[in-house]
Interface confidence: medium
Amino acid sequence: TLNSVLNSNAIKNLPPPLGGAAGHPGSAVSAAPGILYPGGNKYQTIDNYQPYPCAEDEECGTDEYCASPTRGGDAGVQICLACRKRRKRCMRHAMCCPGNYCKNGICVSSDQNHFRGEIEETITESFGNDHSTLDGYSRRTTLSSKMYHTKGQEGSVCLRSSDCASGLCCARHFWSKICKPVLKEGQVCTKHRRKGSHGLEIFQRCYCGEGLSCRIQKDHHQASNSSRLHTCQRH
């Protein structure tokens, strides 16, 4: 269950300010002495971190991935888990910490000196839980080793947003992922609905840039739910 995971060091989310004031995305977050999780009669410490629920890896931090906290992958909520370091087991790239990727079920360094020429990678994106794959849409993609030494430019194949240059994010494009521009003010964005999964977006957009959020365009309020246009707007 999630309770047992919370008692380990697996959950690595920033602690809340005990003062209780709502913070700002850029503000510092003060450390709490410990968050406790009520588990029956016994209280369990979470080592200063709280579980952060997620639906996909992009909702987590750069050093995290989204998965069920239990081995069996129960039907409950998925949370952001700390990324796996080198030589740890993995099932997909996002599970491995930046600078590593998943090869043959193990996180390996993606910037080793002996890398020459090209490496072949199977990019399998996970939807729903840790053990699901894209129903056979596993695409073999050739990645240049240069990708691991310099930040990817627009159109470069990537594994995660940290592989991309500033102003770009790693987003799905067909069955692969490439660096795409972070959305600017006024650009159309995708607003996922809380009910139901995010679905399969084969042409995924980046998120809105800092200081922007994805909202219904003012003149589209009267439109039907399904046809409402969302754009990146100032907070």
Partner: nanobody
């Protein structure tokens, strides 16, 4: 700036019910996870319930079957329906909204916090 305002707290008798609300502004509500935490006097803050952006929910063992977390995207509001309240549920209840992780370049996904609303269960 992200703002979260909780309401609905108060004094209730054991076995009674309360519905807490958390109005959010300054974030794309439906794309972020929400959580309810609580802090009893002299104790640490603890997790009560979570709801992910895809609607999946999770509850602390001590509140399972009694509390229900939900979210109304059209009102940018999260709720915590609390039934069969017990004296040990007495605490300040805090609403928390995830503000996204790698979207802002954070290495860890993080929460924004409301000021809290007091719930007292006593006869």
């Amino acid at each position: 700036e992200v703002q979260l305002v909780e309401s609905g707290g108060g004094l209730v008798q054991p076995g009674g019910s309360l519905r807490l609300s958390c109005a959010a502004s300054g974030l794309t509500f439906s794309t972020y996870p929400m959580g309810w935490f609580r802090q009893a006097p002299g104790k640490e803050r603890e997790l009560v319930a979570l709801i992910a952006s895809n609607g999946n929910t999770h509850y602390a063992d001590s509140v399972k079957g009694r509390f229900t977390i939900s979210a109304d995207n059209s009102k940018n509001t999260a709720y915590l329906q609390m039934n069969s309240l017990k004296p040990e549920d007495t605490a300040v209840y805090y609403c928390a909204a995830g503000n996204g992780g790698r979207a802002y370049g954070y290495s860890r996904a993080r929460y924004e916090w409301g000021q809290g609303t007091l719930v007292t269960v006593s006869s």
